[in-house]
């Protein structure tokens, strides 16, 4: 922590300007009034402060705003944002997308994924929902950031906004997030024709249940293996060999290349070997002919 000293009269600060770069840490602490700093935050980013000096300025703002900075200050943080921790950001209330854009630009190229995730979370809370303007801002300035939101936050996305989401925006989404987004996407694209629907729904299919995957297999969609591999394991396992063949179309030969990877490996283990043989791909590991499969979990549930 910066030690307290009194400010020499000749060092008194009346405005935030370039002369401050020559101040030592303790002089900044003693001579810069926190309220003045807050009022003139828009000047700070133009001044080449050292990281040590920025620490002092942050300390002053923290003292002035122990409950969290107001948006008028947050909007002009500039490189001072790089000093913020997720705990600091959690105290903020942010509603302006201009503020979000400004801070996303600053964070680019820095290891700040936790801070950015918290910032986006605060914006969604501040605005009440994940509206189209917010999604547009995220896709433009922070591809992939949508997936930093919790499933709970993502549940506030109205289906009408889903069309603004691009495949690359979902690249880092986990299964729980796709579980939330998929039903919204299904609703958003429900009036589209078969092929157009598949193109749109494809990035969301990691959240699709078995019955929807089975339905797709009846529509000649020719799903590529990359999409198939992103399907939930639980959605893939009940599919029959015939359904998978119809679902993948000409891409079915890719099963051979991916046979060691889940969910393909797990699916193979659940199929009868003679059914797998009909694909002509040399897939091995299916249930041998003549074997009976007893689902012991059912028996355990009954006992």
């Amino acid at each position: 922590d910066v030690e307290r000293t009194t400010c020499p009269p000749e060092k008194e600060v009346h405005e935030i300007d370039e002369s401050l770069i020559f101040y030592k840490k303790r002089e900044l602490e003693a001579c810069v009034d926190a309220a003045l700093l807050a009022a003139q935050m828009d000047r700070v980013d133009a001044i080449p402060f050292t990281y040590e000096q920025l620490d002092v300025l942050k300390h002053k703002l923290d003292e002035l705003y122990p409950q969290g900075y107001p948006e008028s200050v947050i909007r002009h943080l500039g490189h001072l944002f790089l000093k913020m921790s997720p705990e600091d950001i959690r105290k903020w209330n942010v509603t302006s997308l201009e503020t979000l854009k400004a801070l996303l630009k600053v964070s680019k190229g820095h290891e700040m994924s936790a801070q950015v995730a918290t910032l986006i979370d605060r914006v969604v809370v501040g605005r009440g929902q994940l509206d189209k303007d917010t999604v547009d801002t995220l896709t433009a300035f922070c591809p992939g950031c949508l997936c930093s939101l919790s499933p709970e936050r993502l549940s506030s996305v109205p289906p009408s906004v889903i069309g603004a989401v691009r495949p690359q925006d979902l690249d880092t989404c986990g299964p729980r997030q796709l579980d939330v987004l998929y039903p919204k996407a299904r609703l958003a694209f429900q009036n589209m024709s078969g092929s157009e629907y598949f193109v749109k729904i494809r990035p969301f299919l990691g959240g699709a249940p078995t019955e929807d995957v089975k339905a797709l297999s009846q529509q000649n969609v020719s799903m590529d293996l990359a999409t198939f591999m992103k399907l939930r394991r639980e959605a893939v396992l009940p599919l029959t060999v015939a359904e998978v063949q119809k679902l993948l179309g000409p891409h079915v030969e890719g099963l051979k290349v991916e046979e060691q990877h889940s969910p393909v490996r797990d699916w193979i283990l659940k199929q009868r070997q003679d059914d797998l043989d009909t694909l002509g791909l040399g897939l091995q590991g299916g249930i041998p002919n003549g074997y009976l499969i007893l689902d012991l979990s059912v028996r355990e549930a009954l006992s």
Partner: antibody, heavy 119, light 108 residues
Framework: EVQLVQSGAEVKKPGASVKVSCKAS????????MDWVRQAPGQGLEWMGD????????IYNQKFSGRVTMTEDKSASTVYMELSSLRSEDTAVYYC????????????WGQGTTVTVSS | EIVLTQSPATLSLSPGERATLSCSAS???????LSWYQQKPGSSPRLLIY???NLASGIPARFSGSGSGTDYTLTISSLEPEDFAVYYC?????????FGGGTKVEIK
């Protein structure tokens, strides 16, 4: 432009471990597996294994089982290959190469990382 | 594992000549699962041909591939100065994936 950029050359002692990174850009990271292939000085190419960045699932060439670990960081579009218990015969150039899921050919390669194992 | 044997190990030819490179597999390879790569000294390999006969993006038409079962061929119809390099065949029909030992095409 599609690019795979690998980390710099490494010099290691026998018994140590090395971790090589491969940062991808210019394409949908999770639509392609990342494979690792090595090439000893004056020798041919040897496939080590692959990772599916979407699921984190890995397949390793049995020759390297127990010594190689492949991981991914989706948020950074980066994959890593760690080789442990290094010996002099592990001296090689290590390449990452992307492979469209469902195909087996490598259409884009990293620039290679030279790993030298010497006491 | 499937062993791929390439022959000849070295091919000495002049620019303008036809080059025929062979790749023989120890057991049958599904033809969809064989590719060819070119590598120049100090550079990474580059995909030339995939699925036995499909030309990769940006590869000139003088390169062609053929074959089935255990025998595969890469042909360069008329050698250009930039074609002198090492060529590798590669199979992913059977695990683990393997490469041939390479054929070096050098200037005569």
């Amino acid at each position: 432009e599609v690019q795979l950029v690998q980390s710099g050359a490494e010099v290691k002692k026998p018994g140590a471990s090395v971790k090589v990174s491969c940062k991808a850009s210019g394409y949908t990271f999770t639509d392609y597996n990342m494979d690792w292939v090595r090439q000893a000085p004056g020798q041919g190419l040897e496939w080590m294994g692959d990772i599916n960045p979407s699921t984190g699932g890995t397949i390793y060439n049995q020759k390297f089982s127990g010594r190689v670990t492949m991981t991914e960081d989706k948020s950074a579009s980066t994959v890593y290959m760690e080789l442990s218990s290094l010996r002099s015969e592990d001296t090689a150039v290590y390449y990452c190469a992307r492979r469209r899921i469902g195909t087996g050919y490598f259409d884009v390669w990293g620039q290679g990382t030279t790993v030298t194992v010497s006491s | 594992e499937i062993v791929l044997t390439q022959s000849p190990a070295t091919l000495s030819l002049s620019p303008g000549e036809r080059a025929t490179l062979s790749c023989s597999a120890s057991s049958s390879v599904i033809s969809s699962y064989l590719s060819w790569y070119q590598q120049k000294p100090g550079s990474s390999p580059r995909l030339l041909i995939y699925r036995t006969s499909n030309l990769a993006s940006g590869i000139p038409a003088r390169f062609s591939g053929s074959g089935s079962g255990t025998d595969y061929t890469l042909t360069i119809s008329s050698l250009e100065p930039e074609d002198f390099a090492v060529y590798y065949c590669h199979q992913w029909s059977s695990f683990p994936y393997t490469f041939g030992g390479g054929t070096k095409v050098e200037i005569k």
